[in-house]
Amino acid sequence: SIPWNLERITPPRYRADEYQPPDGGSLVEVYLLDTSIQSDHREIEGRVMVTDFENVPEEDGTRFHRQASKCDSHGTHLAGVVSGRDAGVAKGASMRSLRVLNCQGKGTVSGTLIGLEFIRKSQLVQPVGPLVVLLPLAGGYSRVLNAACQRLARAGVVLVTAAGNFRDDACLYSPASAPEVITVGATNAQDQPVTLGTLGTNFGRCVDLFAPGEDIIGASSDCSTCFVSQSGTSQAAAHVAGIAAMMLSAEPELTLAELRQRLIHFSAKDVINEAWFPEDQRVLTPNLVAALPPSTHGAGWQLFCRTVWSAHSGPTRMATAIARCAPDEELLSCSSFSRSGKRRGERMEAQGGKLVCRAHNAFGGEGVYAIARCCLLPQANCSVHTAPPAEASMGTRVHCHQQGHVLTGCSSHWEVEDLGTHKPPVLRPRGQPNQCVGHREASIHASCCHAPGLECKVKEHGIPAPQGQVTVACEEGWTLTGCSALPGTSHVLGAYAVDNTCVVRSRDVSTTGSTSEEAVTAVAICCRSRHLAQASQELQ
Amino acid sequence: QEDEDGDYEELVLALRSEEDGLAEAPEHGTTATFHRCAKDPWRLPGTYVVVLKEETHLSQSERTARRLQAQAARRGYLTKILHVFHGLLPGFLVKMSGDLLELALKLPHVDYIEEDSSVFAQ
């Protein structure tokens, strides 16, 4: 029978006669930076080329016994998970191995850097098809390792890494914390985060998605036909490297941003039991388990978006947090969130020729997060329209006035410490759909975009008094681009997008009583691209 | 023993190739920064990645490495250039005493220096 992990990544709509990947990743080369490997293992024989690259530290311990099977254990298993004949994800992918970890599984940042440089030079000397680099290793946060990963990613290489097995925030480790790298956490057969004794999978905003990483059957270096089960975020990352190889083989022109968005889009949503994560990390950790797309040509027509959380601003009064999209993604909206509820909103602003999302802490606040909605929108022309606080009138409004521009997101930012003491209007004037409306003491920012065939609509869901959270979702075929709260008073903790649902969190004031003025509305902006849909139909 | 001889050879070369006209002052602009792993047990003091500014050419990287060796030698310190980076990041990997960090941070073209550290299979 099919191992649980391969079954898990196979799409739910899978039928043997329908989903037959033509080549299983044959156009893609996967580089593995790990221990030495047993290249003559039947699972990977002829599929893995061992390069002459080796940069490893000496083993610890005075009486260490170097045994080939132990030296090769980790790398052999991972090569098998990526492309093994029987138990591999991308059975057609070819691999190249670089030895950066010693027999004890230990390496150095410098050795890894030299390995990444070796890959870049190989790519320049002999350009091949799409490249995937698997980094099933982790160390403490390293500026230089993250920088090298960024450079390699910008050279068109897809990097996939283990989130780390420290039951900790992945942002404290490298290369897991590098934004350009696809960082993978581990889940088990019950879709629970993997526990490894006291430790376990890392979590947090630096994780892109999870994948199977417990009791994974793969090639064992004990003999050329042996199999063994291993666990860890390395195994999870190997699954995603295999899925990436399949996707790139089917669509070799995919950029890193497109690949990441597809991986997120085709993942199983909301299946992980979040109670395992520390409470303050649950909202930041993606509830996504990687899966193969239901067909090899898919989804070109869809408007893809993902949510990017910033680092925490810290508690100082003027502290801010910035969330950024990848270079070839568009920032379509910006929101903010504070656990204490003390924040001064958020705004979209230009930085280095690109829009970023900045959230502002308030006096007495424990800090804020900025939340960017980052989307793939070819040929887009987006701008931010701002209206200063209206002060005397019913509320501040701003709309997209340029011809052909549609509203994709609303943000509001205020200088007063507590909007709650400045009561918003009871009645919210309803204007055109291309309009953002907010508190009269706040400046309002509208994200307005022009892109071929882009259409958007506003969806709202309000409840009379705050009860923890209000949600509103976009329907099938539409993608959530903007998520904000009305009226934005002090009991609103913030708004953020989870997949295609806009979540507005507020303090539960049901115990203290409420008035109609304390009603909270979640406002979602849902968009789709007729142009992308037509282009996709023309291809078929 | 071989390692020590290698170090000695490099030291002599560094002294020979010293360029008289080289000033020791850093370039104008921002000061280079030093980074190290937050987890002490994973630190590998004595080996450092010197990262140079983005547009630095390979020849400048090599020259900066030589200059560090020369200035270190003048202070009686042995250094060993383990690798010169180019292709991804400009810079070099150097084995040296932590006492030389202040000196290295003042070299021209230096963006930041990071102490080497361990990574582990996951």
């Epitope: 610890d60 009486r63 260490f64 004890q104 599984g105 490894l196 004794g197 | 047990p41």
Partner: antibody, heavy 122, light 110 residues
């Protein structure tokens, strides 16, 4: 559930030998380093030995070096401590304990057995 | 003779806070991860803190750890009678190539 059960303790004369066993259950034994720790009556904890998850590395306290041998059988999920040339000062409760992780053996111990008593007396 | 020094005893009233220090050197606390263990009377030790300040699941946040230079500290807030026990710090010692425990501290709830 995760469990460690020590056995093999008893009363033994000085100079004689004893072999302690520790049966592990409820976790993947081969993925974790294992320690032996002892506690003399009314005294504090004293670390005795550590073996890596795959048996490739062994470490001993100076007080037992050359006399005690730590080993493991991953197929039987069992840890052993062979104690030779026993002395009166080896009298203690001996605990086996699981290392928090395989590779980061210096992280400490997260699961402990209930202990087995060794008395060395003539 | 332990290379990690702890005070022999500390005491406080219920609900109060106590701190236990653990002093070492650069070869142990200075450059290695510190763990803290609780040993209730007549039982095996139990892990309270690892990696200086991380708590295993099930350990209440009344227990906290910190490190500064070559010393580590365990803090216990909201002291309860059930906290009466011996507490040990522990870390790897790179020069000894072995694990070392502190001398142990008895906590008494008055």
């Amino acid at each position: 559930q995760v469990q460690l059960v020590e056995s093999g303790g008893g009363v033994v004369q000085p100079g004689r030998s004893l072999r302690l066993s520790c049966a592990a259950s409820g976790f993947t034994f081969s993925s974790f380093g294992m320690h032996w720790v002892r506690q003399a009556p009314g005294k504090g904890l004293e670390w005795v030995a550590l073996i890596w998850n795959d048996g490739s590395n062994k470490y001993y306290a100076d007080s037992v070096k050359g006399r005690f041998t730590i080993s493991r059988d991953n197929s039987k999920n069992t840890l052993y401590l062979q104690m030779n040339s026993l002395r009166a000062e080896d009298t203690a409760v001996y605990y086996c304990a699981r290392a928090i992780a395989a590779l980061y053996y210096y992280y400490g111990m997260d699961v402990w057995g209930q202990g087995t008593t060794v008395t060395v007396s003539s | 003779q332990s290379v990690l020094t702890q005070p022999p005893s500390v005491s406080a009233a219920p609900g109060q806070k106590v701190t236990i220090s653990c002093s070492g050197s650069s070869s142990n606390i200075g450059n290695n991860f510190v763990s803290w263990y609780q040993q209730l009377p007549g039982t095996a030790p139990k892990l309270l803190i690892y990696d200086y300040n991380k708590r295993p699941s099930g350990i209440p946040d009344r227990f906290s750890g910190s490190k500064s230079g070559t010393s580590a500290t365990l803090g216990i807030t909201g002291l309860q009678t059930g906290d009466e026990a011996d507490y040990y710090c522990g870390t790897w010692d790179s020069s000894l190539s072995g694990y070392v425990f502190g001398t142990g501290t008895r906590v008494t709830v008055l």
